[in-house]
Amino acid sequence: KAMHVAQPAVVLASSRGIASFVCEYASPGKATEVRVTVLRQADSQVTEVCAATYMTGNELTFLDDSICTGTSSGNQVNLTIQGLRAMDTGLYICKVELMYPPPYYLGIGNGTQIYVIDPEPCPDSD
Amino acid sequence: KAMHVAQPAVVLASSRGIASFVCEYASPGKATEVRVTVLRQADSQVTEVCAATYMTGNELTFLDDSICTGTSSGNQVNLTIQGLRAMDTGLYICKVELMYPPPYYLGIGNGTQIYVIDPEPCPDSD
């Protein structure tokens, strides 16, 4: 079953390469188990950036080596992606799946264009 | 008389606060005197950033204290805005006027969204 997912159109990564955005899913009821996946689309290629399954009311737990962290509140997921470089500029799509209880619901956002600018290197200290 | 003006939708300022974009106007004939104005729109307020009048084939000359520089080639104007800070993020609109010979033509672009990220300060050297 299809589900509406909203996310901002544009986000700027900080000069430290950190970008945060909210992914909000409009469910007709309260799910107990939700899976959130961040996909990156660039040059018509789609790759998975990170994913987490969480029980509503609990924290999102990404893998230890993941570049993503997140928190949830109601149907809103606050996602943070770190370690971004200019070459990571692209469209980051939020995919939400209501895993339990059945039936399964799937929602895919329109994507957030994340712009990343590499910082100028600091001058060497003499 | 109306005239079509094209400019990119989005540009990222460098970490040094420099943003460049091309403003191209579709003139029905060959003008000899052209005026280019850059306007900034933010929070429904429009302010003039800089302006230059030039003779086709010659360099654009902005005022000495202007944050803009530029070059022209045919109907294309290469504009560079410097000294940008995060607070300067906004929609930068290119306005082109064909001043001479008559008739007078006016064209206004859809604007270029310039995103600016302030760099992290470098650590103090001991």
Partner: antibody
Framework: DVQLQESGPGLVTPSQSLSLTCSVT?????????WNWIRQFPGNKLEWMGY???????NYNPFLKNRISITRDTSENQFFLKLNSVTTEDTATYYC????????????WGQGTSVTVSS | DIVLTQSPSSLSASLGGKVTITCKTS??????MAWYQHKPGKGPRLLIY???ILQPGIPSRFSGSGSGTDYSFSINNLEPEDIATYYC????????FGGGTMLEIK
């Protein structure tokens, strides 16, 4: 399309039990969703009574917890309401409806059945 | 229990006009708000869920908005078939309904 249909006696005497059936077509009640009973009192107020989930677990309105039971017959694709020790205050139109999740919006409803509690 | 205060309890409007109904909740419900249309002899019909999402097949004349404890529901370009009673429902904790708004056409 999913359809729900309530049935049961229109008149119940005080202190007796009220029993209603909701027959579901177009979707298996064991496949998903929660299957609810809601009632509307003569003044138009709607009250959620409780549900039985796809897995057979229940959730009831705390105000009714001691008197209510919702069960099901999976072979007939039906679920049932039993309300004990009824009084005239239980006179209402009773609806069955479906919702997603623990709590949720009811996307399909029956047309309702009127129950009067009177001696 | 979360209490929903729906207002007005009744209203009269002209064909082609616009009406707005409000629903105030006794605590923040995280946008878990639904709106129903109810006509005599039928079951309620789900119009909107999660504050503003139109149920498939519902005309865009119907809309919802809100957050926290304050929610509203509007019908634009009123049509004769809109005569009904409208209810709000929260589904953040248990399922509870507002008192209803009876809409009539002038």
């Amino acid at each position: 399309d999913v359809q729900l249909q309530e049935s049961g006696p229109g008149l119940v005497t005080p202190s007796q039990s009220l029993s209603l059936t909701c027959s579901v077509t177009g979707y298996s009640i064991t496949s998903g969703y929660s299957w609810n009973w809601i009632r509307q009192f003569p003044g138009n107020k709607l009250e959620w009574m409780g549900y039985i989930r796809f897995d057979g677990n229940n959730n009831y309105n705390p105000f009714l917890k001691n008197r209510i039971s919702i069960t099901r017959d999976t072979s007939e694709n039906q679920f049932f309401l039993k309300l004990n020790s009824v009084t005239t205050e239980d006179t209402a139109t009773y609806y069955c409806a479906r919702n997603y999740g623990t709590w949720g919006a009811m996307d399909f409803w029956g047309q309702g059945t009127s129950v009067t509690v009177s001696s | 229990d979360i209490v929903l205060t729906q207002s007005p309890s009744s209203l009269s409007a002209s064909l082609g006009g616009k009406v707005t109904i409000t629903c105030k909740t006794s605590q923040d419900i995280n946008k878990y708000m639904a709106w129903y249309q109810h006509k005599p002899g039928k079951g309620p019909r789900l119009l909107i869920y999660y504050t503003s999402i139109l149920q498939p097949g519902i005309p865009s004349r119907f809309s919802g908005s809100g957050s926290g404890t304050d929610y509203s529901f509007s019908i634009n370009n009123l049509e004769p078939e809109d005569i009904a009673t409208y209810y709000c429902q929260q589904y953040d904790n248990l399922n509870t309904f507002g008192g209803g708004t009876m809409l009539e056409i002038k």
